[in-house]
């Protein structure tokens, strides 16, 4: 056995992968390598066996640079059959390589063809359907012919694929099925003698569904109390388990352990293992592990056990001693950091009274008080009382809760009008915002100007996203401000701030905003400030009731900030249905600073033009059509008649006189005055009164004497009356004439 080149793996004196020797012979194996090495033997060969001798690796080979070791096994037996391996020690440089050499030694014994014999009691072999199954009937000689049989009459023949034979391992079944469940045996006939070794395959369900320990971790006990831990393992129907415990006192068997099976579930097994220690001591504290094994399946569950000499309470604030929350929150948890054992009794006080009696919204959860649907009433001092009566231990701790409220503007919550109010032009107006919040909000007033064009209608003239300006009493933005003031008032039991803005002279339309803010949030109320020069923002007027042949003149004036689509319509009733006939549209309207005017003129009316005339306009905010109606009754025409004829009349010179010609007719008659058949025009000293119905002559002279005639005329005809006016005190010349 020469010393050639460097040995990457150790070299054995017996070449090849296997070697057959007879029982009773001596096995001699030498191992040579570049480094120190060790031997690995079959499990059936005990290192303590007197027949076994292994020399430690010593220098050998050329220049003594190699290591040699020998293994000697005197009087080898059949059960010494197995794999013998020489491997470099892991500390050497070759540890990364496969630094070992092995040889399988068959110790042939005609009387023991099988290494292990199971005759009376079959060896239990766990199997899982669909997985590899090995029936481990290893033999002492590779030449032994072995047959695999299944009770009672079946023979499982190796086919080189699903079932194969390996003299070192036994029968290998690639994927086991239910057919391999049951009693199997390996048979070998040597020198006419039949040898049988039996195996019972147990189908492993191996399905551990769940492992739990009750009570849950951590388990806390006082010195002298009893520890009871219940470990439950839930498995599939036909699954067996082995349950064991690891715990601090296991070495001294501190615990008693009982096991039982709960069969109340139709498709599961529930295995219980109950660990019990009476009179626990400090030494029992630590980790308790329940280990559950089923074939190749394994699960474990831990729980930690704490043992205290005596009870204790320690309580601290989890947050600050003064805590803040916000009204309207779904819940708020007031929590204390408590360490105590055993579990103390807990009472929460609010302002000195038991909290849970004060309101059903207070729930105790562990060392926390949960306040549901937080309101301002929940502000106050909260005290946790902790007590362990048996240990005569009591502790308390107080936390203050402040309930903040986002600002609220009372006027916003009151149902607002569907369309904004109108403020009469030039009027003094008082605008109010009533505000509540915790902390007390700061209130500012703002002005959003309306950039509107007087000459054309604009319905979107005033948008809230336009630039806004903060106001103070001296502001000259928008309308003149008389004052901005604030006062505190109690409304419905709470302190509210009333902020008032007084507008001295309503001239400019826009939006006033009151803004209230605190650290919780901001709220804003917009007051649309629409100025109107029209009473109630909508007015209809009829110049006069026309007579047949006259002109009908109607006028409709609406506030332009509130209304659009202005139209005159005539309402007619046909078959008990009111029909709307549009007779004048918006395009004929004129737009002023604050209003839109639409005039309706119907020339030369006839009786058929009588009816209900309505001005219709659409409210910009509600979309509702508003109608203002006026009844028009066209009067029937009649010829003029005088209420009283003129009569001759005497007047003193330089005096004054009035001639009265009252006429009626439809349409109203036109009155014309004549003197001596000449039409009288108004001139100094001659005054024609209203509708020409009176003629007034001041400082009468002798030239004013004569025949005066009045004529009343309309389309239907004319009527006249005459009288002689005598002027007294005239000159002789006049008398002579």
């Amino acid at each position: 056995y020469g010393s050639g080149s460097k040995l990457k793996v150790p070299e054995l004196s017996l070449k090849g992968t296997q070697h057959v020797m007879q029982a009773g012979q001596t096995l001699f194996l030498k191992c040579r390598g570049e480094a120190a090495h060790s031997w690995s033997l079959p499990t059936t060969v005990s290192q303590e066996d007197k027949r076994l001798s292994i020399t430690p690796p010593s220098a050998c080979g050329r220049d003594n640079r190699q290591f040699c070791s020998t293994l000697t096994l005197d009087t080898a037996q059949a059960n010494h059959t197995g794999l013998y391996t020489c491997r470099y020690l892991p500390t050497s440089t070759s540890k990364k390589k496969k630094a070992e050499s092995s040889i399988y030694i068959f110790v042939s014994d005609a009387g023991s063809p099988f290494i292990e014999m199971h005759t009376d009691i079959p060896k239990l072999v766990h199997m899982t359907e669909g997985r590899q199954l090995i029936i481990p009937c290893r033999v002492t000689s590779p030449n032994v012919t072995v047959t695999l049989k299944k009770f009672p009459f079946d023979t499982l023949t190796p086919d080189g694929q699903r079932i194969t034979w390996d003299s070192r391992r036994g029968f290998i079944i690639a994927n086991a099925t239910y057919k391999e469940i049951g009693l199997l045996n390996c048979e070998a006939t040597v020198n006419g003698h039949l040898y049988q070794t039996n195996y019972l395959t147990h189908r492993q369900t191996n399905t551990i569904l769940d492992v739990q320990i009750r009570p849950p971790s951590p388990v806390r006990l006082l010195h002298g109390q009893t520890l009871v831990l219940n470990c439950t393992a839930t498995t599939e129907l036909n699954t067996r388990v082995q349950m064991s415990w690891n715990y601090p006192g296991k070495a001294t068997k501190r615990a008693s352990i009982r096991q039982r099976i709960d069969r109340s579930h139709s498709h599961n097994n529930v295995f219980h293992s109950v660990l019990k220690i009476n009179n626990v001591e400090s030494r029992d504290k630590g980790l308790y592990t329940c280990r559950v094994k089923s074939g190749s399946s394994f699960q474990s569950f831990n729980t930690s056990v704490h043992v205290y000499e005596k009870g204790f309470i320690s309580v601290k604030h989890r947050k600050q001693p003064v805590q803040e929350t916000t009204a309207g929150r779904r819940s708020y948890r007031l929590s204390m950091k408590v360490k105590a054992f055993p579990s103390p009794e807990i009472v929460w006080l609010k302002d000195g009274s038991p909290a849970t009696l004060k309101s059903a919204r207070y729930l105790v959860h562990g060392y926390s008080l949960i306040i549901k649907d937080v309101t301002t009433e929940d502000a106050g001092d909260y005290t946790i009382l902790l007590g362990i009566k048996q240990s005569r231990l009591f502790k308390n701790l107080t936390a203050t809760l402040i309930v903040n409220v986002k600002p609220q503007i009372y006027e916003k919550s009151v149902s607002s009008l569907p369309s904004p109010p109108l403020y009469p032009l030039g009027s003094r107006q008082v605008l109010t915002c009533t505000v509540y919040g915790i902390p007390r909000p700061t209130i500012t007033w703002l002005w959003h100007p309306c950039h509107h064009n007087h000459s054309k209608e604009r319905y979107d003239f005033c948008t809230e996203n336009e630039e806004s300006f903060i106001l103070d009493p001296s502001s000259n933005l928008g309308n003149r401000i008389e004052s901005i003031s604030q006062r505190m008032t109690v409304i419905e039991g709470t302190n509210k701030t009333v902020s008032t803005l007084v507008v001295a002279d309503s001239q400019t339309p826009g939006i006033y905003s009151c803004r209230a803010f605190n650290k919780i949030g901001t709220v804003e109320r917009n007051i649309k400030f629409y100025v109107t020069d029209v009473p109630n923002g909508f007015h209809v007027s009829l110049e006069k009731m026309p007579a047949e042949g006259e002109d009908l003149k109607l006028s409709c004036v609406v506030n332009k900030f509130l209304y659009r689509d202005i139209t005159w319509i005539l309402l007619r009733t046909v078959n008990n249905r009111t029909m709307h006939h549009s007779i004048s549209k918006q395009k004929m309207a004129t737009t002023q600073d604050y209003s839109i005017t639409l005039n309706l003129v119907i020339k030369n009316v006839s009786l058929e033009d009588s009816g209900t005339y309505a001005c219709r306009a659409r409210n910009i905010y509600t979309g509702e059509d508003i109608l203002r109606k006026t009844e028009v009754l066209v009067r029937d025409s009649e010829a003029p008649h005088l209420l009283q004829n003129l009569s001759d009349y005497e007047v003193s010179i330089s005096g004054s006189t009035t001639l009265d010609c009252q006429a009626r007719g439809v349409p109203a008659p036109q009155i014309t005055w004549f003197k001596n058949n000449h039409k009288i025009q108004q001139e100094p000293g001659i005054i024609l009164g209203p509708g020409n119905s009176t003629l007034f002559i001041e400082r009468v002279t002798e030239e004013d004497e004569g025949v005066y005639r009045c004529r009343a005329t309309n389309q239907k005809g004319a009527v006249e009356s005459a009288a002689y006016l005598t002027v007294q005190g005239t000159s002789d010349k006049s008398n002579l004439e």
């Epitope: 239910y178 469940i181 049951g182 009693l183 019972l200 147990h202 189908r203 569904l209 769940d210 839930t234 129907l237 036909n238 067996r240 099976i261 069969r263 109340s264 579930h265 139709s266 498709h267 599961n268």
Partner: antibody, heavy 115, light 112 residues
Framework: QVQLKESGPGLVRPSETLSLTCTVS????????LSWVRRPSGKGPEWLGR???????TYNSAFKSRLTISRDTSKDQVFLKMNSLQTDDTGTYYC?????????WGQGVMVTVSS | DIVMTQTPVSMSVSLGGQVSISCRSS???????????LSWYIQKPSQSPQLLIY???NRVSGISDRFSGSGSGTDFTLKINKIEPDDLGVYYC?????????FGSGTKLEIK
Amino acid sequence: QVQLKESGPGLVRPSETLSLTCTVSGFSLSDYSLSWVRRPSGKGPEWLGRLWFDGDTTYNSAFKSRLTISRDTSKDQVFLKMNSLQTDDTGTYYCTRDDRDFDYWGQGVMVTVSS
Amino acid sequence: DIVMTQTPVSMSVSLGGQVSISCRSSQSLVNNNGNTYLSWYIQKPSQSPQLLIYKVSNRVSGISDRFSGSGSGTDFTLKINKIEPDDLGVYYCGQNTQYPLTFGSGTKLEIK
């Protein structure tokens, strides 16, 4: 291969006791649970009870007072004893391996309860 | 007890055809570990019952894929495609979720 075979009398007098035997092969009674199921003529099957792999038993509460299931593992046999039989106990009685539900059944034994 | 109701009681079908058998339980068959233990069995003439499907939809090894199970909670269905002469018999559903284990009263399948 897995086999189950029921045996016992075909005729039983009213108020007497029914004794049936189920002999199994191809599996171990130590590994599998086994149930008895009967099918009264013209009706659906009825589960009577289960013998667990470790020898424990669970019975249908409707039959608990008059039913006993036991086994002899060395003989691979399971026994059913039902007393106080009435005519409506007539039907076919099966033993069935109880694993993935009832995966193997015996051929059944027809039992008539009549005087 | 959980009552299992099968419909129809019987049905006649042509070879190559398809059938659906319904099974309804009086309460949910979902077990505390989340499994649903509903099985289907066939009993062919003068034979003992044979397991076809377990846990609602799992076919037993060796059972043709013409058989399929579905459903959840309380409503379950067995479908058989491409009916063959060997498929005739009585089909039963059974529950193994709660004691006592119970079965439906059966659906008899006949070939036209």
